[in-house]
């Protein structure tokens, strides 16, 4: 999708639905692209992103990507279509209301990614193991 500072022409008349056939509406996500971050060794972090946007496409969800290498830590916040890979990974948890970070294998860095389907859910990124799929809040499927 497009970052907040880039404009684009959008004319698409499809009705987008989720897996259950319900009409999918766009949602509000933090959208700062890549920023340096101080989030490290914490159970959860706030994004510290001051830019909120309505995703351009109804099917898009909120995504956060946390990366750490020898030099710095960055946090990326965007809207993205879960049907398409992001950073070569599938967004498995796109229906979750919370952004639960999962580690992905990337050479030369520590790489965590999460996606979620409630407004501004990528503002609070969760690393803690206590939030797992047995948490009833994660079983809540949200279409906003």
């Amino acid at each position: 999708t497009i970052p907040p500072h880039v404009q684009k022409s959008v004319n698409n008349d499809m009705i987008v639905t989720d897996n259950n056939g319900a009409v999918k509406f766009p949602q509000l996500c933090k959208f700062c692209d890549v920023r340096f971050s101080t989030c490290d060794n914490q159970k959860s972090c706030m994004s510290n992103c001051s830019i909120t946007s309505i995703c351009e496409k109804p099917q898009e969800v909120c995504v956060a990507v946390w990366r750490k290498n020898d030099e710095n830590i960055t946090l990326e916040t965007v809207c993205h279509d879960p049907k398409l890979p992001y950073h070569d990974f599938i967004l498995e948890d796109a229906a979750s209301p919370k952004c639960i970070m999962k580690e992905k294998k990337k050479p030369g860095e520590t790489f965590f990614m999460c996606s979620c389907s409630s407004d501004e859910c990528n503002d609070n990124i969760i690393f803690s193991e206590e939030y797992n799929t047995s948490n009833p809040d994660l079983l809540l499927v949200i279409f906003q």
Epitope: P4, P26, T52, E56, P97, S118, D119, I142, Q144
Partner: antibody
């Protein structure tokens, strides 16, 4: 069927307070963010406030910041708007609406009149 | 003064096509999806278009929306007397951190 029913409007003096409620039914209230939008008599729509599904995130229009407080009780399927230090320019029909990216359902509105 | 600019009025005859414009800036329409709302006299607003060009179920395909750059527009084809209403565009403003509406356009069917 999705229904939003506002209540709590009425006549109040400048400087006074009111608490509006919005009772939701027909959908899983705790899964949706909610908003308040108002419309002064004969004027256009003005967004007032928004609250996330789990009330972690709230936003307010500059015109009400510091005076109005949005809250929700998911166990009661109810949205609230606490309005303090009311001014004449707050006179309007107040609507609660579902979501923020697109207000897909609206209540019928409750009239708030601020006058001495 | 509204953040989004709409013409205060528009008119057309039955069967005609009418377009209502909505102009904003890079912090609102330029970077956020736009919605359109219809408000019939004495009633609450109703969602007409979301995500720039998508229609909720139940909205006739005579209504269509589009967006380009920092402007959006609502087109109504095959105008009918029941389309006489106020129309509002709306979107998030990433600079103001709030939702913004246009001033509204009163559509008259002559």
């Amino acid at each position: 069927e999705v229904q939003l029913l506002e209540s709590g409007g009425g006549l109040v003096q400048p400087g006074g307070s009111l608490r509006l409620s919005c009772a939701a039914s027909g959908f899983t209230f705790s899964s949706y963010s909610m908003s308040w939008v108002r419309q002064a008599p004969g004027k256009g729509l003005e967004w007032v406030s928004w609250i996330s599904y789990n009330d972690r995130s709230v936003y307010y229009a500059d015109s009400v910041k510091g005076r109005f407080t949005i809250s929700r009780d998911n166990s009661k399927n109810t949205l609230y708007l606490q309005m303090n230090s009311l001014r004449a320019e707050d006179t309007a029909v107040y609507y609660c609406a579902r979501r923020i990216a697109a207000f897909d359902y609206w209540g019928q509105g409750t009239l708030v009149t601020v006058s001495s | 003064q509204s953040v989004l600019t709409q013409p205060p009025s528009a008119s057309g005859t039955p069967g005609q096509r009418v377009t209502i414009s909505c102009t904003g800036s890079s912090s609102n329409i330029g970077s956020n999806a736009v919605s359109w709302y219809q408000q019939l006299p004495g009633t609450a607003p109703k969602l007409l278009i979301y995500a720039n060009s998508h229609r909720p179920s139940g909205v006739p395909d005579r209504f269509s929306g589009s967006k380009s750059g920092t402007s959006a527009s609502l087109a109504i084809s095959g105008l009918r007397s029941e389309d006489e209403a106020d129309y509002y565009c709306g979107t998030w403003d990433s600079s103001l951190s709030g939702y913004v509406f246009g001033g509204g356009t009163k559509l008259t069917v002559l």
